[in-house]
Interface confidence: low
Amino acid sequence: LPAQVAFTPYAPEPGGTCRLREYYDQTAQMCCSKCPPGQHAKVFCTKTSDTVCDSCEDSTYTQLWNWVPECLSCGSRCSSDQVETQACTREQNRICTCRPGWYCALSKQEGCRLCAQLRKCRPGFGVARPGTETSDVVCKPCAPGTFSNTTSSTDICRPHQICHVVAIPGNASMDAVCTSTSPTRSMAPGAVHLPQPVSTRSQHTQPTPAPSTAPGTSFLLPVGPSPPAEGSTGD
């Protein structure tokens, strides 16, 4: 570059490169300014005028310094089994993640394409491995001496109460029933719950497609219809 500060647009030295936040425009053969995040190139540079940038319109964004003619469209709004963990702004795309009680069975570059409800372990089975954001719950049969009487994605097998005199012996899905003398327990009483995060959407109980199902278009995030028409003033 020349010794003095060069203002865009300028011609780079032979074999030279443009500076940070500049790009080389092949048509003008000049180094020109990029547009900042949240904006796009409204008018490309010429030999005598620099790039003209303009703000992204609603529901569009650019995340990086750029010289794109149009901003990128934000993804469609989060489906009903998801929560919006990052809103659509002029500088970032919306990110949807599965709501609590669900996990991502089919991921995409950002967020999740298909959420599936966490498996619930039925009575006689307890949680062997809790669900994560990207993996389902693993259930296991309750071992002798333990039980689970719930249908739950969080409850583990609990030990039977220890009776002085057993009225009804416990099994995998039922605790032991003692005679009137007070029982003891080999571990702390009550169901053991694995922690669940708080949701901003209701926890639905409807079944969802199993993650093993080959994903069809019905599982994709819906592309909403076109936006409602603006009134006479617009923004």
Partner: antibody, heavy 118, light 110 residues
Framework: QSVEESGGRLVTPGTPLTLTCTAS????????MIWVRQAPGKGLEWIGY?????ITDYASWAKGRFTISKTSTTVDLKVTSPTTEDTATYFC???????????????WGQGTLVTVSS | ALVMTQTPASVEVAVGGTVTIKCQAS??????LAWYRQKPGQPPKLLIY???KLASGVPSRFSGSGSGTEYTLTISGVQCDDAATYYC????????????FGGGTEVVVK
């Protein structure tokens, strides 16, 4: 495009009642729908949503008292055991269906009147 | 629970005047707010969504503003036809919600 409610009538307390919202000119597999009611001289009271994928959300007070379901062209609201407090005009409405601005309703029916009286 | 509080409950305004209706959310709703107008015997009509965007066919004398938890509907150059009840509605979440609608504001035009 339109929505139209039907099924409103005079019922005695405890008699189950199903209201139907019929959609014309658009697909219920694409749009979310809402049921809202309005008691005489009162404000709008949300009952519940049914999302395009069939999943439902209810107002906390409405859980167990109402059930929303749908077919390809209708959205039904079942009032499981009506009381006199359920006397109201019941509206269904369609979500604007656009991602950017949250959940709003641009297409409303004229409403159907339910009177619960012994 | 997320609660929408609308004020005032009733307001009187002269033809040609300006009326302001406020809506407060008990937590931030990120501009996910709509305003509706309802006349007696009719269903609500969407006026504004996204806190400030006019719905199709709505005249420019209606405007919406606000962010976070505080939102405002302003009607300037009020006409007789604007006599109605106006409702705000949060479009942010359906979790832990009794009613996404505010209680309503009756606008009386003198």
């Amino acid at each position: 495009q339109s929505v139209e409610e039907s099924g409103g009538r005079l019922v005695t307390p405890g008699t189950p009642l199903t209201l139907t919202c019929t959609a014309s000119g658009f697909s219920l597999s694409t749009y979310d729908m809402i049921w809202v009611r309005q008691a005489p001289g009162k404000g709008l009271e949300w009952i519940g949503y049914i999302w395009s994928d069939g999943i439902t959300d209810y107002a906390s007070w409405a859980k167990g008292r109402f059930t929303i379901s749908k077919t390809s062209t209708t959205v039904d609201l079942k009032v499981t055991s009506p009381t006199t407090e359920d006397t109201a005009t019941y509206f269904c409405a369609r979500d604007v269906g656009y991602a950017g601005y949250g959940y709003y309703f641009d297409l409303w029916g004229q409403g159907t009147l339910v009177t619960v009286s012994s | 629970a997320l609660v929408m509080t609308q004020t005032p409950a009733s307001v009187e305004v002269a033809v040609g005047g300006t009326v302001t209706i406020k809506c407060q959310a008990s937590q931030s709703i990120t501009n996910y707010l709509a305003w509706y107008r309802q006349k007696p015997g009719q269903p609500p009509k969407l006026l504004i969504y996204g806190a400030s965007k006019l719905a199709s066919g709505v005249p420019s004398r209606f405007s919406g503003s606000g962010s976070g938890t505080e939102y405002t509907l302003t009607i300037s150059g009020v006409q007789c036809d604007d006599a109605a009840t106006y409702y705000c509605q949060q479009g942010y979440t359906s979790s832990n919600v009794d009613n996404p609608f505010g209680g309503g504001t009756e606008v009386v035009v003198k």
